[in-house]
């Protein structure tokens, strides 16, 4: 009976999310394998988040709006492990917008989700950021490694969206 009511709850939650995400990929989690964590298909999952690589070339503002429509934000990178996971799925000859910007050009970088910008957990390429005119951050492959670079916000790039996993 308990299992039945849990299944009914899950089904109703799935139906609720289905209006936003036509398909979800879920895995069982938790010590009793009773919780399901889901990401929209074909998003990828890492720890408690889902990631989507958009190959549509758009400005930073349009890229953030695009993520927002999907219930996400441009990606906020919190650890080297997270960056390493993300870059496994990126093309080395492309650049991708991050959810990091400096809208006033004061070198006060800010994440879209208001996560505090921690200079000690940043992955700028050597010599970057290098221009107060360039107020948005991308991740690209340079000098044999993935890192961040400041660029003009209105120049279209690919982008990475991030959202919290859906738990049902």
């Amino acid at each position: 009976n308990f299992m039945y009511s849990k299944t009914v709850k899950r089904l109703s939650k799935l139906q609720e999310y289905q209006q936003y995400y036509p398909s979800l990929t879920c895995v069982m989690e938790g010590k009793d394998m009773e919780d399901w964590s889901c990401c929209p298909t074909p998003w990828t999952s890492f720890q408690s988040s889902c990631y989507f690589i958009s190959t549509v070339m758009q400005s930073w503002t349009k890229s953030q709006n695009n993520c927002s429509v999907m219930g996400a934000d441009l990606v906020v990178i919190n650890t080297k492990e997270e960056q390493d996971f993300i870059t496994q799925n990126l093309k080395i000859n492309s650049a991708y917008f991050l959810g990091l910007s400096d809208p006033k050009g004061w070198r006060h970088w800010q994440w879209v989700d208001q996560t505090p910008y921690n200079k000690n957990v940043t992955f700028w390429h050597s010599g970057e950021p290098n221009s107060p005119d360039e107020r948005c951050a991308i991740i690209n492959f340079r000098s044999e490694e993935w890192g961040w670079n400041d660029v003009h916000c209105h120049v279209p790039q690919k982008s990475i969206c991030k959202m919290k996993k859906i738990y049902i």
């Epitope: 758009q58 400005s59 930073w60 503002t61 349009k62 953030q64 709006n65 910007s101 809208p103 006033k104 050009g105 290098n130 221009s131 107060p132 005119d133 360039e134 107020r135 948005c136 660029v151 003009h152 916000c153 209105h154 120049v155 279209p156």
Partner: antibody
Framework: EVQLLESGGGLVQPGGSLRLSCAAS????????MSWVRQAPGKGLEWVAT????????YYPDSVKGRFTISRDNSKNTLYLQMNSLRAEDTAVYYC??????????????WGQGTTVTVSS | DIVLTQSPDSLAVSLGERATINCKAS??????????VNWYQQKPGQPPKLLIY???NLESGIPDRFSGSGSGTDFTLTISSLQAEDVAVYYC?????????FGGGTKVEIK
């Protein structure tokens, strides 16, 4: 006072090349992103190229990509536009302009007087 | 590309009267409370001159009879009291996304 002086325009045959220069003074050129904008005779304005202050990032519309190259020499306070494989539709007055960021966008705040490029056989 | 459509193509206004120029974008050029539309004035034989940036901010040194308004996809440049020296072509421009694009221009003349 900001001054931008374009030069290098002239008459060139289709398929030919030309290099435009823009000599800048009255501001710290090396800290400014710069752009070229053109205006065909009796027509409107068309953005042609942009280069960041350090010269390591350049941007072009599809209409000139692969044919035009923007560059700069910060030691000479000069902006350049190398134009190859010129076509009749490249005939225009070419202006250089300073770029000023505005949050996530920008404005072109100072413009030179322009130099005329005519592509004709 | 973002297309900007200006109207009217030309406008004849009496001295001291109001002139209004419209600019419609093919998609929104707003983000986080700012609109990325600029207005330029071009007099015959001269380069363009920046009048308004961010849809409504008056550039330094520009007379306050010029004003800009609008958001999203619809923008307006207003000259509250037309002066003889305002005879020119006026262009809107978007800087939200490359390629930067300009409207086709509106020619303002004295009636």
């Amino acid at each position: 006072e900001v001054q931008l002086l374009e030069s290098g325009g002239g008459l060139v045959q289709p398929g030919g090349s030309l290099r435009l220069s823009c000599a800048a003074s009255g501001f710290t050129f090396s800290t400014y992103t710069m752009s070229w904008v053109r205006q065909a005779p009796g027509k409107g304005l068309e953005w042609v190229a942009t280069i960041n202050s350090g010269g390591d990032n350049t941007y072009y519309p599809d209409s000139v990509k692969g044919r035009f190259t923007i560059s700069r020499d910060n030691s000479k306070n000069t902006l350049y536009l190398q134009m190859n494989s010129l076509r009749a539709e490249d005939t225009a007055v070419y202006y250089c302009a300073t770029y000023r960021p505005y949050y996530y966008g920008s404005v072109l705040d100072y413009w030179g007087q322009g130099t005329t490029v005519t592509v004709s056989s | 590309d973002i297309v900007l459509t200006q109207s009217p193509d030309s406008l004849a206004v009496s001295l001291g009267e109001r002139a209004t120029i419209n600019c419609k974008a093919s998609q929104s050029v707003d983000y986080d409370g700012n609109s990325y539309v600029n207005w330029y004035q071009q007099k015959p034989g001269q380069p363009p001159k920046l009048l308004i940036y961010g849809a409504s901010n008056l550039e330094s040194g520009i007379p306050d009879r010029f004003s800009g308004s609008g958001s999203g996809t619809d923008f307006t440049l207003t000259i509250s009291s037309l002066q003889a020296e305002d005879v020119a072509v006026y262009y809107c421009q978007q800087s939200d996304e490359d390629p930067w694009t300009f409207g086709g221009g509106t020619k303002v003349e004295i009636k």
